[in-house]
């Protein structure tokens, strides 16, 4: 609906009530340290109720946490940015007017991040096909708390051979994360030729370890167009 603000009829007095319990179902919030957390208590009533917040049953004051917190009355929400372990506890919204009071309690657990090697989303990058002269994108979704280094690598041939004297394959780094590289998780290939066909590897490393996944590019002759589905979903299946 275009207009979603409901003004209470001044004669219809009403104690506070929850207007969107769906937003309140998740009572336990386990949040990684440094993330933002938001608790909501959407309510109505007439006169319009006020909202206050308690932490562990006591009035929650701005000075109780470094950086304070934000309350958006129009959203009926409490927002804490960059949570730390000392933010753990029970948070209760108390919504009241002269006709009554209701409350709801959330439990916040702040999870300290344990470093791990990068995790790559399964199925990405995905195999792709395009015609000669076409464009294609490979996407590699990376999950890493520690700063990840992303490389896009392709097997290449040297003097007609795919392998060097040491038996290792010849590899070419096509793109890597760094100052001059925007959105390293995406490798875009434009105006492809048959020589671009082959295996493309997304290799991601951080100080703990590394992970890699690969996809194949098939380059078709101009007259043999690939299916639409593959082209326009850009491998987010």
């Amino acid at each position: 609906m275009a207009e979603d603000f409901v003004s209470e009829n001044s004669n219809n007095k009403r104690a506070p009530y929850w207007t969107n319990t769906e937003k309140m179902e998740k009572r336990l919030h386990a949040v990684p340290a440094a993330n933002t957390v938001k608790f909501r208590c959407p309510a109505g009533g007439n006169p319009m109720p006020t909202m206050r917040w308690l932490k562990n049953g006591k009035e929650f004051k701005q000075e109780h946490r470094i950086g304070g917190y934000k309350v958006r009355n129009q959203h009926w929400s409490l927002i804490m940015e960059s949570v730390v372990p000392s933010d753990k506890g029970n948070y209760t919204c108390v919504v009241e007017n002269e006709y009554g009071s209701i409350n709801h309690t959330y439990h916040l657990d702040v999870v300290e991040r344990s470093p791990h090697r990068p995790i790559l989303q399964a199925g990405l990058p995905a195999n792709a096909s395009t015609v000669v002269g076409g464009d294609v994108e490979f996407v590699c979704k990376v999950y890493s708390d520690a700063q990840p280094h992303i490389q896009w690598i392709k097997h290449v041939e040297k003097n007609g051979s795919k392998y060097g004297p040491d038996g290792l394959p010849y590899l070419k780094v096509l793109k890597h994360s760094g100052i001059n590289s925007s959105n390293a998780e995406v490798l875009a290939l434009f105006n492809v030729t048959e020589a671009d066909a082959g295996e493309y590897i997304c290799k991601v490393s951080n100080y703990i370890g590394q992970a890699n996944q690969s996809a194949w590019l098939t380059v078709l002759p101009k007259q043999q167009a690939p299916g639409r589905e593959k082209e326009h979903h850009h491998h987010h299946h």
């Epitope: 003004s7 207007t19 933002t36 938001k38 959407p42 958006r72 009355n73 940015e81």
Partner: antibody
Framework: QVQLLESGGGLVQPGGSLRLSCAAS????????MSWVRQAPGKGLEWVST????????EYADSVKGRFTISRDNSKNTLYLQMNSLRAEDTAVYYC????????????WGQGTLVTVSS | DIQMTQSPSSLSASVGDRVTITCRAS??????LNWYQQKPGKAPKLLIY???NLQSGVPSRFSGSGSGTDFTLTISSLQPEDFATYYC?????????FGQGTKVEIK
């Protein structure tokens, strides 16, 4: 119908000031949070600032904090953005936008006003 | 700040195609995500709010899904008037952020 009309844009030198206005009509202005969003030439959208209907909640993007001030006059149905210490990177089209109630989706936008910071 | 990463940055498609644009948040943002369409020289237009709700007056070929960190905008059958740039926008944090945009061009 809901209408938002920005004004006050123009050419200003680095270090200078400008005050943008957004005249609102077609809805109960004081019931809604309002925001400023900007777009540098050829670039994407960047949120600048938000103010709730009663002015009790105000927030700014880090890039403008301490230089820009958002305010509103509910009796005049007008939103303001006072911009001081302007920089070249503040050059953009500035849009005012209304937030849906109970949400922060910008459901109505003005046509935008261009601010150019250049010597 | 919460970073929003949109992909692809651009795509070429034909009228009638099904188009999918994704947006990923750097942390859980529940369903506090909106999608906008913008045409050159015009103000953005709200398409989807709270991840999956269709804004009044927006054609039903537009749909949104997702929650947490991964979100999708789908155009089921691309129309000529749909060639534009699309942005996602999170409001979970008090510091709102937009994705960098996805330009949908005519093939």
């Amino acid at each position: 119908q809901v209408q938002l009309l920005e004004s006050g844009g123009g050419l200003v030198q680095p270090g200078g000031s400008l005050r943008l206005s957004c005249a609102a009509s077609g809805f109960t202005f004081s019931d809604y949070a309002m925001s400023w969003v900007r777009q540098a030439p050829g670039k994407g959208l960047e949120w600048v600032s938000t103010i709730e209907g009663d002015s009790n909640y105000i927030e700014y993007a880090d890039s403008v904090k301490g230089r820009f001030t958002i305010s509103r006059d509910n009796s005049k149905n007008t939103l303001y953005l006072q911009m001081n210490s302007l920089r070249a990177e503040d050059t953009a089209v500035y849009y005012c936008a209304r937030e849906r109630t109970y949400s922060s989706a910008f459901d109505y936008w003005g046509q935008g006003t261009l601010v150019t910071v250049s010597s | 700040d919460i970073q929003m990463t949109q992909s692809p940055s651009s795509l070429s498609a034909s009228v009638g195609d099904r188009v999918t644009i994704t947006c990923r948040a750097s942390q859980d943002i529940s369903s506090d995500l909106n999608w906008y369409q913008q045409k050159p020289g015009k103000a953005p237009k709200l398409l989807i709010y709270d991840a999956s709700n269709l804004q009044s007056g927006v054609p039903s070929r537009f749909s949104g899904s997702g929650s947490g960190t991964d979100f999708t905008l789908t155009i089921s059958s691309l129309q000529p008037e749909d060639f534009a740039t699309y942005y996602c926008h999170q409001w979970y944090s008090t510091l709102y952020t937009f994705g960098q945009g996805t330009k949908v061009e005519i093939k």
